[in-house]
């Protein structure tokens, strides 16, 4: 098809070589002032189209994306040639950064419903560059955390080194939907809820004497609970004695609840105390048996092939620790009577 009638948009993706980041292209820009996006050639600029063929309608999931090869070859279907690019409804997701993503991307509806729809397409010229300015070493991350129940903010990585006063107007999207009230380089959240989690996109315009570009950055925001203020607690064993049968195999389980920590280095281990001696036991790897936003429940077992008389004189101690502190629970084995 002839792409000369497509509306054109230029985008710039400046990626950090230090971090993994994603990028997105939207097939349409659902802003009221973009209503000429799928302009119908017969309308004068003052006329308002009565219905835009696929803007804001359900057809949006039914768009086709192409890349225009720089050598003038025919358009290539994104889905067939680019495994690191994923189409999700009307959004194109670039999973890995790199200058090889530079190029022209075209999207149009799959269903052409009328002769006017032929020109209903968008051409996006994407330029991808690695970040060079070392002047801003504290630029916002492309992965940002918000603390549930508290006040927080989401910063636009490409503008986070500028003060609010000198920052240009920013257009924000969350999960592909325009956030029309947000225009600054930072979204302030008065109280963080789990629905604030998602993929945020911030755009601003950068112009020179020749042309203007949309500078875009993508931020993955997750909502987290605050770091625990508690040391882990041992859920099992509860009792400090355990009845056993001599000569039989035995497994003692230690289950501990660890509260959330952003930097999480849990310790859960078994050691044996025998009179004045104590030593750590080589036991199977610890495993999580439950995982929630607030905590991980981690289990580690000690396995005795057969219980001996000597084991009855020993104490088996489970030791658990996080950055706050540690807890222990000891178990004394007692021979079952009768």
């Amino acid at each position: 098809f002839n792409i000369s009638g497509c509306s054109t948009k230029k985008l710039l993706w400046t990626y950090s070589t230090r971090s993994e980041e994603e990028f997105v292209l939207f097939c349409d820009l659902p802003e009221p002032q973009k209503s000429h996006f799928c302009h119908r050639n017969r309308l004068s600029p003052k006329q308002v189209p009565e219905h835009l063929p696929f803007m804001g309608s359900n057809d949006l999931s039914d768009v086709q994306w192409y890349q225009q090869p720089s050598n003038g070859d025919p358009l290539e279907d994104i889905r067939k040639s680019y495994p690191h690019i994923i189409q999700d409804k009307c959004t194109l997701h670039f999973l890995t950064p790199g200058v090889n993503n530079s190029g022209s991307y075209i999207c149009r509806p799959k269903m052409i419903k009328s002769p006017y729809d032929v020109a209903c397409c968008v051409k996006m010229i994407l330029e991808v560059k690695p970040q060079t300015n070392a002047s801003c070493e504290y630029s916002a991350s492309h992965k940002q955390d918000l603390l549930l129940g508290s006040t927080g903010s989401i910063s636009c990585p490409s503008l986070s080194c500028q003060s609010d006063a000198q920052s240009p107007a920013v257009t924000w999207y969350k999960n592909g939907k325009l956030l029309s009230v947000e225009r600054s380089n930072r979204i302030v959240v008065d109280e963080v809820y789990d629905y604030h989690q998602g993929t945020y996109v911030c755009d601003y315009t950068q112009s020179d004497t020749v042309s203007s570009w949309t500078v875009r950055a993508v931020v993955q925001v997750r909502t987290i609970v605050g770091d625990t203020k508690l040391k882990p607690d041992i859920l099992d064993p509860v009792e400090d004695t355990l009845e056993v049968e001599l000569g039989k195999p035995l497994t003692i389980s230690c289950k501990a609840r660890f509260g959330f920590e952003r930097v999480f280095n849990p310790v859960i281990k078994w050691y044996i105390k025998d009179s004045d001696l104590e030593w750590e036991v080589s036991v199977p790897e610890a495993k999580s048996i439950k995982s929630t936003l607030k905590d991980e429940i981690i289990e580690r077992n000690i396995i005795l092939e057969k219980v001996t008389q000597r084991d009855l004189r020993r104490k088996f101690v489970c030791f658990v620790q996080n950055s706050i502190g540690n807890t222990t629970q000891s178990v004394q084995l007692k021979e079952k009577r009768g």
């Epitope: 997750r222 495993k287 999580s288 048996i289 995982s291 929630t292 936003l293």
Partner: nanobody, 115 residues
Framework: DVPLQESGGGLVQPGGSLRLSCRAS????????MGWYRQAPGEQRHLVAT???????NYGDSVQGRFTISRENNGNVVELQMHSLKPEDTAVYFC?????????WGQGTQVTVSS
């Protein structure tokens, strides 16, 4: 975040087999749930298979009987053995882990089934 490293994608003929592997590094314990999801062009991400440390396995409808998920010594390596592959299995396959109740995703590995 816990980094997930995937390997084993590629091009395979219909009816062929492929094995995907994913390792979660830097964690001092076995993560509760690990698994695989896939995303075909123009579609949402769909469950392929997951396995918990308790041995509970869950498969997506379309792969039941053809794909097998396993965890090496119940540790932080999850493997997906795929047999009788069909063109409709073509997708980007993402490793997934649940860590403090949150989804963690790998970068994805492309699987293409084509003659």
């Amino acid at each position: 975040d816990v980094p997930l490293q995937e390997s084993g994608g590629g091009l395979v003929q219909p009816g062929g087999s492929l094995r995907l592997s994913c390792r979660a590094s830097g964690v001092g314990f076995s993560i509760y749930t690990m698994g695989w999801y896939r995303q075909a062009p123009g579609e949402q991400r769909h469950l392929v298979a997951t396995v918990t440390t308790g041995g509970h396995i869950n498969y997506g409808d379309s792969v039941q009987g053809r794909f097998t998920i396993s965890r090496e010594n119940n540790g932080n390596v999850v493997e997906l053995q795929m047999h009788s592959l069909k063109p409709e299995d073509t997708a980007v396959y993402f490793c997934n882990a649940i860590y403090f109740g949150q989804d963690i995703w790998g970068q994805g590995t492309q699987v293409t089934v084509s003659s």
